[in-house]
């Protein structure tokens, strides 16, 4: 009986967290559009969690369409987003792993995980729901992947999804991939402005970490991400104190957001501009 078969699998705590999208449009299905051209393009497949090739007809379609594999990865895969910095020669933890647990100023009661540098382990804490710092993970697995010492120091940050062999559940499979950048400050302040998927045009503000300022954008009314504020004041209060760090082979470079010439910022400017 298929119902009984379904009961036999245990999904353990080594399971990686479900996919979190950088941009809501990355979830759209590839759409070739109504025209008849044959153009090689790339889209992000939410089920394989990879950028894949498709043939675009040349008109209409949707935003999940990129001219190159690299552009697709940059916009839709997590190792190019608000996570960690690593080079293949580096095995040190991101700096935010050494921050103390910070519940923030709000009064939610959300279970989160932080890396405790005293015990060298990820531990549970109660997060208030806003502000705090980046030593704050939704799952124990994510915390361990990023902050605890692994066999080679690399972070698990690229996911592929498979359905579990016995009980049909969608279980992400990990690939160990070194990531590039590290951010400090509330993590949602570092995400690009995201209109969301609906059709309204509401005036909102988002924090542009490239230029270190709060900028207006049009919100569709649903979806999107937490980098979304109803006033400029609210945006500044939540995000202005953050800064970006970059680790290169030469060590740590701290850069205040106002300086515009850093290469790390140029790379991210593309994301912010293209998303608008």
């Amino acid at each position: 009986d298929s119902e009984e078969d379904e009961e036999h699998t245990i999904i353990t705590d080594t399971e990686l967290p479900p996919l979190k999208l950088m941009h809501s449009f990355c979830a759209f299905k590839a759409d070739d559009g109504p025209c008849k051209a044959i153009m090689k393009r790339f889209f992000f497949n939410i089920f394989t969690r990879q950028c894949e090739e498709f043939i675009y007809g040349g008109c209409e379609g949707n935003q999940n369409r990129f001219e190159s594999l690299e552009e697709c990865k940059k916009m839709c895969t997590r190792d190019n987003a608000n996570r960690i910095i690593k080079t293949t020669l580096q095995q040190e933890k991101p700096d935010f792993c050494f921050l103390e647990e910070d519940p923030g100023i709000c009064r939610g009661y959300i279970t989160r995980y932080f890396y405790n540098n005293q015990t060298k382990q990820c531990e549970r804490f109660k997060y208030g729901g806003c502000l705090g710092n980046m030593n704050n993970f939704e799952t124990l697995e994510e915390c361990k992947n990023i902050c605890e010492d692994g066999p080679n120091g690399f972070q698990v940050d690229n996911y592929g999804t498979q359905l579990n062999a016995v009980n049909n559940s969608l279980t992400p499979q990990s690939t160990k991939v070194p990531s590039l950048f590290e951010f400090h400050g509330p993590s949602w302040c570092l995400t690009p402005a995201d209109r969301g998927l609906c059709r309204a045009n509401e005036n909102r503000f988002y924090y542009n970490s490239v230029i270190g300022k709060c900028r207006p954008f049009k919100y569709s009314g649903c979806g999107g991400n937490e980098n979304n504020f109803t006033s400029k004041q609210e945006c500044l209060r939540a995000c202005k104190k953050g800064f970006i760090q970059r680790i290169s082979k030469g060590g740590l470079i701290k850069t205040k957001r106002k300086r515009k010439k850093q290469r790390v910022k140029i790379a991210y400017e593309e994301i912010f501009v293209k998303n608008m």
Partner: antibody, heavy 122, light 108 residues
């Protein structure tokens, strides 16, 4: 074992309230978005509501908006559906389901409970 | 808002191929999932993302989706495949999950 078990169903009068619970086990509950789906006797499946893994986003079918509230307690691995102002047409088996693979609505429900029957009748 | 339409019933002889359709405006641009539900039981996911088969689901189940129609195909239908089948998609315009009306598959 991966399991969802609904409870709290029963007979209630029109205009009354009921709170359904769904106990999850065998997976990292606080990583997954969850759904309620219902099925009226002899009818098809009807989506009721979704909630994101950290409760920050909730979504409702038009037919229940303003009357039903979805919530979750990740510390207890439990999903809830508070149903107020119940109507005869809310009579159904209510299933809780896990959104497999990701938070986004594009993902399917890969794990389902066995359902709990709610009967609204005078 | 997208609406999904399924035939109320489909009949097939054992060993033959059953095809269950699900139609909706421009449905090919949406991801479609299929669920099997046997009497008195919860639904079971049999196809996700148009054409992906969960492990544990027999290879005879497959899916396709283009134009205005998604199709669930069961090759070499067996008696235990007799069940109700539902297609499902996600309407991103109003952030709602939409099910088809269901198709009762009868294995003659």
């Amino acid at each position: 074992q991966v399991q969802l078990v609904e409870s709290g169903g029963g007979l209630v009068q029109p205009g009354g309230s009921l709170r359904l619970s769904c106990a999850a086990s065998g997976f990292t509950f606080n990583s997954y978005a969850m759904s309620w789906v219902r099925q009226a006797p002899g009818k098809g499946l009807e989506w009721v509501s979704n909630i994101s893994s950290n409760s920050s986003n909730t979504y409702y079918a038009d037919s229940v908006k303003g009357r039903f509230t979805i919530s979750r307690d990740n510390s207890k691995n439990t999903l809830y559906l508070q149903m107020n102002s119940l109507r005869a047409e809310d009579t159904a088996v209510y299933y809780c389901a896990r959104k497999g693979g990701g938070e986004h609505g594009f993902f399917p429900s890969d794990i389902w409970g066995q359902g709990t029957l709610v009967t609204v009748s005078s | 808002d997208i609406e999904l339409t399924q035939p109320p019933s489909v009949s097939v002889a054992p060993g033959q191929t059953a095809r269950i359709s699900c139609s909706g405006d421009n449905l090919g641009t949406y991801y479609v999932h299929w669920y099997q539900q046997k009497p008195g039981q919860a639904p079971v996911l049999v196809i996700y993302g148009d054409n992906n088969r969960p492990s544990g689901i027999p290879e005879r189940f497959s899916g396709s989706n283009s134009g205005n129609t998604a199709t669930l195909t069961i090759s070499g239908t067996q008696a235990e495949d007799e069940a109700d089948y539902y297609c499902q998609t996600y309407d991103s315009n109003n952030e709602s999950i939409v099910f088809g009306g269901g198709t009762k598959l009868t294995v003659l």
